[in-house]
């Protein structure tokens, strides 16, 4: 019961695997917590120990590595299930130790059921394809290390529930699925089923990912400010509410940070004394182009406020834009009674 460096439950690595399929799970210690790998640890005399806590239990127990057909085994820093069962769900701990050193981390493993159309509670990775961009491929993910290179598995691809055969612009090519020209109609869930033999048994690996067709970098432009513009003048009397929308369109750009902000007389609204509020809303098109609107609001505008410069700014990886709102003070209409009196020569 000597002290052990406990990294706790690593919920960042919520591992989900399908029921009745092989699963290989690497001990996260070497990937994310320690500065050395398993080989180094092993040659330094450290031992890797696995144990688990069943779902809805508090009791840590050793993993049974003596199951029929070696259903659960360990190989170096990998825990193998051949295959998984539903009640394998729980928190798994790998501990690296010797007489003077100890480090451990736990992680949740969820064994998930799927239906005949591959629907399940599994969180699906998203792969983005550029619209009308030429040939693009997706690859059946997370199948490395399950079988040696000498084994030639069979791979079947599905879109939703349907086996991909004779599709117009989607062609299965072994582990890859090629999209000749991606269109919005290609959005959906794609599943590869990898079937391979091992020790006289046949195993299946099912991998589903979501394909999302997004705007192409060929069509990407700097942000476009729709409002404010040259056609709208914000003409207000002191005491009225001033509302100016800054509406900006952003082309989809992979990993681009889209920013919108207001300046008033060259300063951020937070840095000035006037009582201004800004509300933001965001909407997306089917190809993930983005429209951001920031509405600048001054409840009771003063004549000084109506002389200020209100500028909407926007920036993406493609460039920066800015547009000043046309703000002016409304000239009060002449009072009719006074005009009339003067007109009649009243004194």
């Amino acid at each position: 019961s000597e002290r052990c460096d406990d990294w706790g439950l690593d919920t960042m690595r919520q591992i989900q695997v399908f029921e009745d399929e092989p699963a290989r799970i690497k001990c996260p210690l070497f990937e994310h917590f320690l500065k050395f790998n398993y080989s180094t640890a092993h040659s330094a005399g450290l031992t890797l120990i696995w144990y688990w806590t069943r779902q809805d239990r508090d009791l840590e127990e050793p993993i049974n590595f003596r199951l029929p057909e070696n259903r659960i085994s360990k190989e170096k820093d990998v825990l193998w299930f051949r295959p998984t069962l539903l009640n394998d769900t729980g928190n798994y701990t790998c501990m690296l130790r010797n007489t003077t050193y100890c480090s451990k981390v736990a992680f949740p493993l969820e064994v998930v059921q799927k239906d005949s159309c591959f629907n399940s509670p599994m969180k699906l990775p998203v792969h983005k394809l550029y619209i009308e961009y030429g040939i693009q491929r997706i690859t059946c993910p997370n199948v490395d290390g399950y079988f040696p290179s000498s084994v030639k598995p069979t791979i079947t691809w599905y879109m939703g529930c349907y086996k991909i055969q004779n599709f117009n612009n989607v062609i299965p090519e072994g582990m890859n699925l090629s999209f000749l020209i991606a269109l919005i109609s290609n959005n959906g869930n794609y599943t590869c089923v990898v079937t391979y033999p091992e020790n006289g048994r046949t195993f299946h690996l099912t991998r589903t990912l979501t394909v999302k067709v997004v705007g192409s970098p060929k069509n990407a432009v700097p942000p476009v400010i729709h409002s404010p513009n040259d056609h709208v003048v914000y003409e207000k009397e002191p005491g009225e509410e001033l509302l100016i929308p800054c509406t900006v369109y952003f082309s989809f750009l992979m990993d681009s940070r889209n920013e919108v902000w207001w300046t008033i007389d060259g300063k951020k609204p937070d840095d000035i004394t006037i009582d201004v509020t800004i509300n933001e809303s965001i909407s997306h098109s089917r190809t993930e182009d983005e429209t951001r609107t920031q509405i600048l609001s001054i409840k009771k505008v003063t004549s000084e406020d109506l002389k200020r410069s209100y500028v909407c700014h926007a920036r993406s990886a493609k460039g920066e834009v800015a547009k000043a709102a046309k703000v002016k003070q409304k000239v009060p209409a002449p009072r009719y009674t006074v005009e009339l009196a003067c007109g009649f020569g009243a004194t």
Epitope: V221, P222, P223, V224, I225, D230, V233, T263, D265, G266, S309, Y310, V311, K318, G319, E320, V321, A322, K323, A324, A325, K326, V327, K328
Partner: antibody, heavy 117, light 112 residues
Framework: SLEESGGRLVTPGTPLTLTCTVS????????MGWVRQAPGKGLEYIGI??????TYYASWAKGRFTISKTSSTTVDLKMTSPTTEDTATYFC??????????????WGQGTLVTVSS | DIVMTQTPASVSAPVGGTVTINCQAS??????LAWYQQKPGQPPKLLIS???TLESGVPSRFKGSGSGTEFTLTISDLESADAATYYC??????????????FGGGTEVVVK
């Protein structure tokens, strides 16, 4: 950076093309403009080309000048029929923004055009 | 066409003093105004855009104000390095209106 070239002595009526060569600037992300300055005089705006290639000119410059993007790194100013009044240093300038204002935050050193018979 | 009129044509003030340059537009340009500094033999340098937005690296001694048709550039705590010609500019370059990015005639600032 921006560098103008093509300035020289020409006779009135002889077309002349000035070139602005940019480096480290993506012309699809900025508007580019041309401004001139006659010797000892003030700045005079000629026109601007947007990041997408739309051109805008000062009223006096329409028909006398043509701005175009000739490659991903060059913007040209064509003087269709120069007169002696067109003698000036011609500056190429980059807009501060992608949308077209004429807020010129980066300038070349200028190229001198002398129109004389 | 928009015409920008700058006054005075020349102004002189001592080191540490303040100068004010005025710029008038022939029609309302709202907040679309920039100020530039130009020294002999050099290209202009952008100081201020959108009436009051200081370019990065420009000292806060430079202050732009105004709206509509009347604009002012104030330079306080004058330094000898501020001696230059200053231009205002309407920045309607892409509006399609004639002379949308017209410059004023310039104001020469002499620092004594």
């Amino acid at each position: 950076s921006l560098e103008e070239s093509g300035g020289r002595l020409v006779t009135p009526g002889t077309p002349l093309t000035l070139t602005c060569t940019v480096s480290g600037i993506d012309l699809s992300s900025y508007a580019m403009g041309w401004v001139r300055q006659a010797p000892g005089k003030g700045l005079e705006y000629i026109g601007i080309i947007s990041n997408s290639g739309t051109t805008y000119y000062a009223s006096w410059a329409k028909g006398r000048f043509t701005i175009s993007k000739t490659s991903s790194t060059t913007v040209d100013l064509k003087m269709t029929s120069p007169t002696t009044e067109d003698t000036a240093t011609y500056f190429c300038a980059r807009d501060r923004y992608a949308n077209t204002h004429g807020i010129f935050s980066l300038w070349g050193q200028g190229t001198l055009v002398t129109v004389s018979s | 066409d928009i015409v920008m009129t700058q006054t005075p044509a020349s102004v002189s003030a001592p080191v540490g003093g303040t100068v004010t340059i005025n710029c008038q537009a022939s029609e309302s340009i709202y907040s679309d105004l920039a100020w530039y500094q130009q020294k002999p033999g050099q290209p202009p340098k952008l100081l201020i855009s959108f009436v009051a937005t200081l370019e990065s690296g420009v000292p806060s001694r430079f202050k732009g104000s105004g709206s509509g048709t009347e604009f002012t550039l104030t330079i306080s705590d004058l330094e000898s390095a501020d001696a230059a010609t200053y231009y205002c500019q309407c920045t309607y370059g892409g509006s399609g209106s004639g002379n949308g990015a017209a410059f004023g005639g310039g104001t020469e600032v002499v620092v004594k």
